[in-house]
């Protein structure tokens, strides 16, 4: 595909990436799919600086990111290494809480009202953020 050199309309450029901030809610999988069809992925937070940028744009609203443990270990959707990477969990999170009564635990990560992360039931209809990198070849699907 051709190289993307500027962000699409209604996307926000920051540090050679483009970000799109939803104003409606979807389950994590539908948000993930939405971003894939944008030739993008749910946001992957790799630094404190990127955390502050995203937090500034989403405000105090629960918002999905591209981090989940639906298949066991925590994984970023673009393949970024979780263990060695940036983390910003709330205290005592993630806890894979089963007490919500919705069946199963909590397998998808989101920004909470203060920006720190929590794991939650993936079916909850939260807002989401898509991210795509500038200078990458377009129309290459992100890694699962």
């Amino acid at each position: 595909g051709s190289e993307r050199t500027c962000c699409p309309v209604n996307w926000v450029e920051h540090e050679r990436s483009c970000y799109w901030f939803s104003r409606s809610g979807k389950a994590w999988a539908d948000a993930d799919n939405y971003c894939r069809l944008e030739d993008a992925h749910l946001v992957v937070v790799t630094s404190w600086e990127e955390q502050k940028f995203v937090q500034h744009h989403i405000g105090p609203v629960n918002t999905w990111m591209g981090l989940h443990d639906q298949n066991g270990p925590w994984k970023w959707v673009d393949g970024t290494d979780y263990e060695t990477g940036f983390k910003n969990w709330r205290p005592e999170q993630p806890d894979d809480w089963y007490g919500h009564g919705l069946g199963g635990g909590e397998d998808c990560a989101h920004f909470t009202d203060d920006g720190r992360w929590n794991d939650d039931v993936c079916q909850r209809p939260y807002r989401w953020v898509c991210e795509t990198e500038l200078d990458k070849a377009s129309q290459e699907p992100p890694l699962l």
Epitope: N10, N33, E38, D39, C130, P141
Partner: antibody, heavy 115, light 107 residues
Framework: EVQLLESGGGLVQPGGSLRLSCAAS????????MSWVRQAPGKGLEWVSG????????PYADSVKGRFTISRDISKNTLYLQMNSLRAEDTAVYYC????????WGRGTLVTVSS | DIQMTQSPSSLSASVGDRVTITCRAS??????LAWVQQKPGKAPKSLIY???SLQSGVPSKFSGSGSGTDFTLTISSLQPEDFASYYC?????????FGGGTKVEIK
């Protein structure tokens, strides 16, 4: 209830143009990716073009790239496909489809390219 | 592009039979897969989305399973109205791609 209704098909000569429309209702149009899919007589389903939920991604099949243009009007809940430089091999039934979450299809509109 | 390989391309079955159609993706598509039924001269109709979720109004004799690269559509007890063509479709990423189809015919 999700409804998709295509229109604009017809008989056109090679090299001619047509604009297909797809009127959508029953869902938040701007929140979903949409696609055009076609089916030539006696053949399988072939994706033609799509537009992402934000409108920022509008990819095309190689067979129509440079000739077809997808667009949408959110105020009218309508998806469009502008087809230029039509060829005989573009003859097909063209379907509009909502492709994320529960998948929905329109009834289709027939495009015949013939002299 | 993601290739979708569907098998068999056709099958003959009797009313009441259990029918299974398989679809394989050339790369991991998570569960972003739909199964579509099409009868001659009619528009496609979605049966299953998200690999295993039944579309509203579709009878429960249809079921889907799988994740990643391997998927299955099962019709638990074939009825006369089920004789049609069936396609798998990935919507993990553009370009959307379809399997070649399976034509289910009366034995």
């Amino acid at each position: 209830e999700v409804q998709l209704l295509e229109s604009g098909g017809g008989l056109v000569q090679p090299g001619g143009s047509l604009r297909l429309s797809c009127a959508a209702s029953g869902f938040t149009f701007s929140s979903y990716a949409m696609s055009w899919v076609r089916q030539a007589p006696g053949k399988g389903l072939e994706w033609v073009s799509g537009i992402s939920g934000s409108g920022g991604n509008t990819p095309y099949a190689d067979s129509v790239k440079g000739r077809f243009t997808i667009s949408r009007d959110i105020s009218k809940n309508t998806l469009y496909l502008q087809m230029n430089s039509l060829r005989a091999e573009d003859t097909a039934v063209y379907y509009c489809a909502k492709v994320v979450g529960a998948v929905h299809w329109g009834r289709g509109t027939l495009v015949t390219v013939s002299s | 592009d993601i290739q979708m390989t569907q098998s068999p391309s056709s099958l003959s079955a009797s009313v009441g039979d259990r029918v299974t159609i398989t679809c394989r993706a050339s790369q991991d598509i998570s569960n972003y897969l739909a199964w579509v039924q099409q009868k001659p001269g009619k528009a496609p109709k979605s049966l299953i989305y998200a690999a295993s979720s039944l579309q509203s109004g579709v009878p429960s004799k249809f079921s889907g399973s799988g994740s990643g690269t391997d998927f299955t559509l099962t019709i638990s007890s074939l009825q006369p109205e089920d004789f049609a063509s069936y396609y798998c479709q990935q919507y993990n990423s553009f370009p959307l791609t379809f399997g070649g189809g399976t034509k289910v015919e009366i034995k």
